[in-house]
């Protein structure tokens, strides 16, 4: 059982200090921007990260959601990563859901996140470069050190 | 703008402890994000990570040096510190530190200092 | 940890040649989070890419990576007298951090 706290507005960033954002065909991608590119891209560059009481306490339980026009809440479905037009829901009567992501800091980095899906133990979103994109996926993490799963996460509240 | 120095001893007696200093000046040490690096080059050879600590004191090793090294920050001093206990003569090289912005690539290095171990 | 194999060892062009650095990765770093330094004698390294192929600050474009999962080349379009030196690359997708053994670029 998941019960809806406080949400809070975020810049995510991956190791290259690249911004995580909702292009035009609703992917997420990390992109290279100044922090006045950043502002002028809004709202698809601020992320909704709501909070979530967890009945099996397993590390913060959260959503990332993003509002363009409409409201978009970030799913890992069958292990791939999308935006689904929908709200974060405020209760989930399940132990996993494929928009609850466990949020926990990385040992021996200060300010670093990761973030593990409720659905499939052991996968972590993740940066991927494919070709010219860095694309944010999911990701079995494989082996210890996977530094690909490192995320900065900055409160723009 | 932000500069790095190291210093401490260049020579080093085996068994004993290697203990060096970097100074950051230009820039508070403070700066939120950055991690506070040390690296070394052996004689001749390619570089290796040692190892670093956030303003906040929070370290990482790397695991084949681990159980030797301590890597110490001193905000008040705008300092950043390193030491290697039981050296041996594979330990001699040039030390560096370096600042890592967060993501593990280092776009600013000291000078440099060799430390050579020998009795 | 991985290992990343730099060749050639050494690179003999002349200046207004085109030089090409080959990195080798013992594993995928799909991540992209590779970069490319320079070392000059009796110098410190200095950041020249990062993430495969971005140019570090006050980088000339005449400096260009590219390359995915374990395969990354470094390339200098028209080599400049102040271009021979010796260049890393350096992997941060895993720990530990991992630097390549160098390729040295010198004169012919």
């Known amino acids: 059982y998941f019960g809806k706290l406080e949400s809070k507005l975020s810049v995510i960033r991956n190791l290259n200090d690249q911004v995580l954002f909702i292009d035009q065909g609703n992917r997420p991608l990390f992109e290279d921007m100044t922090d006045s590119d950043c502002r002028d891209n809004a709202p698809r560059t601020i992320f909704i990260i709501s909070m979530y009481k967890d009945s099996q306490p397993r590390g913060m339980a959260v959503t990332i959601s993003v509002k363009c026009e409409k409201i978009s809440t970030l799913s890992c479905e069958n292990k791939i990563i999308s935006f689904k037009e929908m709200n974060p829901p405020d209760n989930i009567k399940d132990t996993k859901s494929d928009i609850i992501f466990f949020q926990r800091s990385v040992p021996g980095h200060d300010n670093k996140m990761q973030f593990e899906s409720s659905s499939y133990e052991g996968y972590f979103l993740a940066c991927e470069k494919e070709r010219d994109l860095f694309k944010l996926i999911l990701k079995k993490e494989d082996e210890l050190g996977d530094r690909s799963i490192m995320f900065t996460v900055q409160n723009e509240d | 703008q932000v500069q790095l120095q190291e210093s401490g001893p260049g020579l080093v007696k085996p068994s004993q402890t290697l203990s060096l200093t970097c100074t950051v000046s230009?820039?508070?040490?403070?700066?939120?994000?950055?991690?506070w690096s040390w690296i070394r080059q052996h004689p001749g050879k390619g570089l290796e990570w040692i190892g670093h600590?956030?303003?906040?004191?929070?370290?990482y090793s790397n695991p084949s040096l681990k159980s030797r090294v301590t890597i110490s920050v001193d905000t008040s001093k705008n300092q950043f510190s390193l030491k290697l206990s039981s050296v041996t003569a594979a330990d001699t090289a040039v030390y560096y530190c370096?600042?890592?912005?967060?993501?593990?690539?280092?776009?600013?290095w000291g000078r440099g200092t060799l430390v050579t171990v020998s009795s | 940890e991985i290992v990343l194999t730099q060749s050639p060892g050494t690179l003999s062009l002349s200046p207004g040649e085109r030089a090409t650095l080959s990195c080798r990765a013992s594993?995928?770093?799909?991540?992209?989070?590779l970069a490319w330094y320079q070392q000059k004698p009796g110098q410190a390294p200095r950041l020249l890419i990062y993430?495969?192929?971005i140019r570090a600050t006050d980088i000339p474009d005449r400096f260009s990576g590219s390359g995915s999962a374990t395969d990354f080349t470094l390339t200098i379009s028209r080599l400049e007298p102040e271009d021979f030196a010796v260049y890393y690359c350096?992997?941060?997708?895993?720990?530990?951090?991992?630097f390549g053994g160098g390729t040295r670029v010198e004169i012919n």
């Open positions: 600590i956030s303003y906040r004191g929070t370290t």
């Open positions: 370096a600042r890592d912005r967060g993501g593990g690539f280092f776009d600013l």
């Open positions: 594993q995928s770093v799909n991540s992209g989070y």
């Open positions: 993430g495969v192929s």
């Open positions: 350096q992997q941060y997708g895993f720990s530990p951090l991992t």
């Open positions: 230009g820039g508070s040490i403070n700066s939120g994000g950055y991690y």
